[in-house]
Interface confidence: low
C-alpha cells in the first residue's frame, strides 16, 4: 500500500486486543483544508518500539488502515480511498511488545468535522456567587461550541464537568470553587450540533487558588539593637507553600499567594505615620520601639486571615547618654546628635504603668549644636515628667519621619521627674550601736532607687557636735546601711543621709542625733 492511501488489506500484525490499561486514546479526526484530513491521538505507556495504525471502516463494511509508524498524527487526502461524505468509523491500533492495543472508536462524517481549538490565550478567572467563572475569547471562525471542563486538586483525580452550549464571540463557564485547596482546570471544545464531531485538545492548565488563601505560618526573630539604633527583623520560617495539582507545579500563574508584612510602630504615637506595608521578602530594619507585625496572605480572590505578633521594645538602657538640666524656666535634655536635620521623638512613661500611657513629643528637624548635641526643652507648666516618680525615656531619630522603617533608637534611659533631689531624700534613718566605737546607720531606700541607673550613690554625713568635725562616707546605691567607726563614747553626733544622681546633689535627711554610752567598769 502507498503511504498516502488507506490500505485495504489485513494489517501486518495479529488481530488481538490485549485489554491493556495503556495504549492509544483520545482519537480526533477532522478536515484541515478543502481536500486534506488529519487524525491525531495520544499514546499512554512506554513508546519504544510502538507502531500505530489508523483503522477505518466505511459504511459499506470495507476496512483499511494507514500505517503511522511511531507518529501519533497522520494526514491524508480525499484521494486516499476513504469516504469523506458518508460516515466512517475510525480507531487506532498500536502494535507493541507483540500485542495490540486499541483506542475507542469514533464515528463521524469527515467532511463536516471541523478541527476545533481549545480556549486559546488568556482565560480570565473571577469569583461569582461562591463559584468560579472562566471567560475567554472564542477562537476565530469557531462560534458555536459545546464546552467541557475537567478539574483536579493535589489529592484528587480529574473530574469532568459541562459548561453547556456556547454561541458568542466570548465563551464562559461556571465551575466549582474550593475553599482551601488549589485546583487545576482544563477546557475543551467541539463543534455544536455536528454529529460525532471530535473534541479539541484540552487547553493549557488554568491554575486557581483556593477561595481562602492559606494562613501564613511564619516565625520571626529580631536581632540585637545595633550601634546605629536599629535591629533587623528576620524571618525564621518561610510561609508554607500552597500544595499544587500536578499541572500547576513549577510556574503556575493564578495560584500565587502574596504575603505582605504590615508593621505598626506602637512607640512614639505622636509621629506622622504609624503603619507600613511591605513585601515579605524585604525584611526591614526596625528601631528599638515596640511593634505589632502582621503577615497578611492574599491571592487573586483577595486577602485571607492574617497572623499577628508583638515585638516588644528593646529595653537596653544607656545610663550616661542623656544629660538633663533642671533650671528655673524648665528642663532641658541633651544627648549626642545623630546627624544633620534629624527629627527626634522623645517618649516617656511612668515606670510600672501600661505602655498605652506613654507620652511623646516630636521635635522639628534639628542640626547638632556646636558640642554635637541635640536638645529638647520643656517648661514646668507643661507638666511633662513633672510628677516625682520614675520615668522611662526613649529617644528615637529619623531623617525621614514619614517613613516608618527609617526610625532608629538613639537611647533609652530612666529619669526621675519633679524635684528629684528632695523626693529622693532617704527616710527612716536609724542608728544602732555596733561596738564600743562604731555604730550601724540604716535607712529606707531612696525613691530614686526605683529608677534604674538614676541613683549614683548615697552619702552619709557624720558630724561631731563637740569639735564640729564632719566626715562624709559614699555608699553604693545598692546598699542602705553603713558602719561608722572611730567614734568616741559620750560625744554627741548627728548623722544625715542624702541620695545623689549623676547630675543632681540630693537633699540631706533630717539630722539624727546619737551618742555611744560611756562604759563604766565595775
Amino acid at each position: 500500500c502507498r503511504t498516502s492511501e488507506c490500505c485495504f488489506q489485513d494489517p501486518p500484525y495479529p488481530d488481538a486486543d490485549s485489554g491493556s490499561a495503556s495504549g492509544p486514546r483520545d482519537l480526533r479526526c477532522y478536515r484541515i483544508s478543502s481536500d486534506r484530513y488529519e487524525c491525531s491521538w495520544q499514546y499512554e505507556g512506554p513508546t519504544a518500539g510502538v507502531s500505530h495504525f489508523l483503522r477505518c471502516c466505511l459504511s459499506s463494511g470495507r476496512c483499511c488502515y494507514f500505517a503511522a509508524g511511531s507518529a501519533t498524527r497522520l494526514q491524508f487526502s480525499d484521494q486516499a480511498g476513504v469516504s469523506v461524505l458518508y460516515t466512517v468509523t475510525l480507531w487506532v491500533e498500536s502494535w507493541a511488545r507483540n500485542q495490540t492495543e486499541k483506542s475507542p472508536e469514533v464515528t463521524l462524517q469527515l467532511y463536516n468535522s471541523v478541527k476545533y481549538e481549545p480556549p486559546l490565550g488568556d482565560i480570565k478567572v473571577s469569583k461569582l456567587a461562591g463559584q468560579l467563572r472562566m471567560e475567554w475569547e472564542t477562537p476565530d471562525n469557531q462560534v458555536g461550541a459545546e464546552v467541557q471542563f475537567r478539574h483536579r486538586t493535589p489529592s484528587s483525580p480529574w473530574k469532568l464537568g459541562d459548561c453547556g452550549p456556547q454561541d458568542d464571540d466570548t465563551e464562559s463557564c461556571l465551575c466549582p470553587l474550593e475553599m482551601n485547596v488549589a485546583q487545576e482546570f482544563q477546557l475543551r471544545r467541539r463543534q455544536l450540533g455536528s454529529q460525532g464531531s471530535s473534541w479539541s485538545k484540552w487547553s493549557s492548565p488554568v491554575c486557581v487558588p483556593p477561595e481562602n488563601p492559606p494562613q501564613p505560618q511564619v516565625r520571626f526573630s529580631v536581632e540585637q539593637l545595633g550601634q546605629d539604633g536599629r535591629r533587623r527583623l528576620t524571618l525564621k520560617e518561610q510561609p508554607t507553600q500552597l500544595e499544587l495539582p500536578e499541572g500547576c507545579q513549577g510556574l503556575a500563574p493564578g495560584t500565587e499567594v502574596t504575603y505582605r508584612l504590615q508593621l505598626h510602630m506602637l512607640s512614639c504615637p505622636c509621629k506622622a505615620k504609624a503603619t507600613r506595608t511591605l513585601h515579605l521578602g524585604k525584611m526591614p530594619y526596625l528601631s528599638g520601639a515596640a511593634y505589632n507585625v502582621a503577615v497578611i496572605s492574599s491571592n487573586q480572590f483577595g486577602p485571607g486571615l492574617n497572623q499577628t505578633w508583638h515585638i516588644p521594645a528593646d529595653t537596653h538602657t544607656e545610663p550616661v547618654a542623656l544629660n538633663i538640666s533642671v533650671g528655673t524656666n524648665g528642663t532641658t535634655m541633651y544627648w549626642p546628635a545623630r546627624a544633620q536635620s534629624m527629627t527626634y521623638c522623645i517618649e516617656w512613661q511612668p515606670v510600672g504603668q501600661d505602655g498605652g500611657l506613654a507620652t511623646c513629643s516630636l521635635t522639628a528637624p534639628q542640626d547638632p549644636d556646636p558640642a554635637g548635641m541635640a536638645t529638647y526643652s520643656w517648661s514646668r507648666e507643661s507638666g511633662a515628667m513633672g510628677q516625682e516618680k520614675c520615668y522611662y525615656i526613649t529617644i528615637f531619630a529619623s531623617a525621614h519621619p514619614e517613613k516608618l522603617t527609617l526610625w532608629s533608637t538613639v537611647l533609652s534611659t530612666y529619669h526621675f521627674g519633679g524635684n528629684a533631689s528632695a523626693a529622693g531624700t532617704p527616710h527612716h534613718v536609724s542608728v544602732k550601736n555596733h561596738s564600743l566605737d562604731s555604730v550601724s546607720v540604716d535607712w529606707a531606700p531612696s525613691l530614686l532607687s526605683t529608677c534604674p541607673g538614676v541613683l549614683k550613690e548615697y552619702v552619709v554625713r557624720c558630724r561631731d557636735e563637740d569639735s564640729k568635725q564632719v566626715s562624709e562616707h559614699p555608699v553604693q546605691p545598692t546598699e542602705t546601711q553603713v558602719t561608722l567607726s572611730g567614734l568616741r563614747a559620750g560625744v554627741a553626733y548627728t548623722v544625715q543621709v542624702r541620695a545623689d544622681t549623676a547630675w543632681l546633689r540630693g537633699v540631706w535627711s533630717q539630722p539624727q542625733r546619737f551618742s555611744i554610752e560611756v562604759q563604766v567598769s565595775d
Epitope: 503511504t3 498516502s4 500505517a67 503511522a68 511511531s70 498524527r73 497522520l74 494526514q75 491524508f76 486516499a80
Partner: nanobody, 123 residues
Framework: EVQLMESGGGVVQVGGSLRLSCAAS????????VGWFSQAPGQDREFVGA????????DYKDSVKGRFTISKDNPKNTVFLQMDSLKPEDTAVYYC????????????????WGQGTQVTVSS
C-alpha cells in the same frame, strides 16, 4: 534540537546521476520522517519523496518514481537521495526536512530544514 545539513549537489548532464546526503546532528532521526523537497527559481518548495526513518517506509512523487531512491544509513544518522536519469526539469535547490506526519507532502508539515544544495541538470 535537530540540525540538518545537505550535501552532494552539483552540475550534471541530462541522464546523469547524483547522490545527495542529509546528515543530522543534535538528535536522532528515528522518530521522524525525512522528506526531500525541491525548489526551482520563483517556485514553491515541492515534495520529492520521504522516508520514515524507523521503518524505512518511502514515499515519492509520481514524476520521480523509478528514477529517485531514498535510503538511510542508521549509524551515520544520514538519509540519501539517489537521483538517476536526471532531466532539466529536476534543476532546483534540494532541501531535506523532518516531520512526524505520515504521508505529509506539504512543506508546512515539516520542520528543522537544512540550508539546501543546488542541483543543475544541463543539456
Amino acid at each position: 534540537e535537530v540540525q540538518l545539513m545537505e550535501s552532494g549537489g552539483g552540475v550534471v548532464q541530462v541522464g546523469g546521476s547524483l547522490r545527495l546526503s542529509c546528515a543530522a546532528s543534535g538528535g536522532t532521526l528515528y522518530s521522524y520522517i525525512v522528506g526531500w523537497f525541491s525548489q526551482a527559481p520563483g517556485q514553491d518548495r515541492e515534495f520529492v519523496g520521504a522516508i520514515e526513518y524507523s521503518g524505512g517506509i518511502t514515499d515519492y512523487k509520481d514524476s520521480v518514481k523509478g528514477r529517485f531512491t531514498i535510503s538511510k544509513d542508521n549509524p551515520k544518522n544520514t538519509v540519501f537521495l539517489q537521483m538517476d536519469s536526471l532531466k532539466p526539469e529536476d534543476t532546483a535547490v534540494y532541501y531535506c526536512g523532518l516531520t512526524r506526519v505520515v504521508g505529509a507532502r506539504n512543506p508546512g508539515d515539516y520542520a528543522y530544514w537544512g540550508q539546501g544544495t543546488q542541483v543543475t541538470v544541463s543539456s
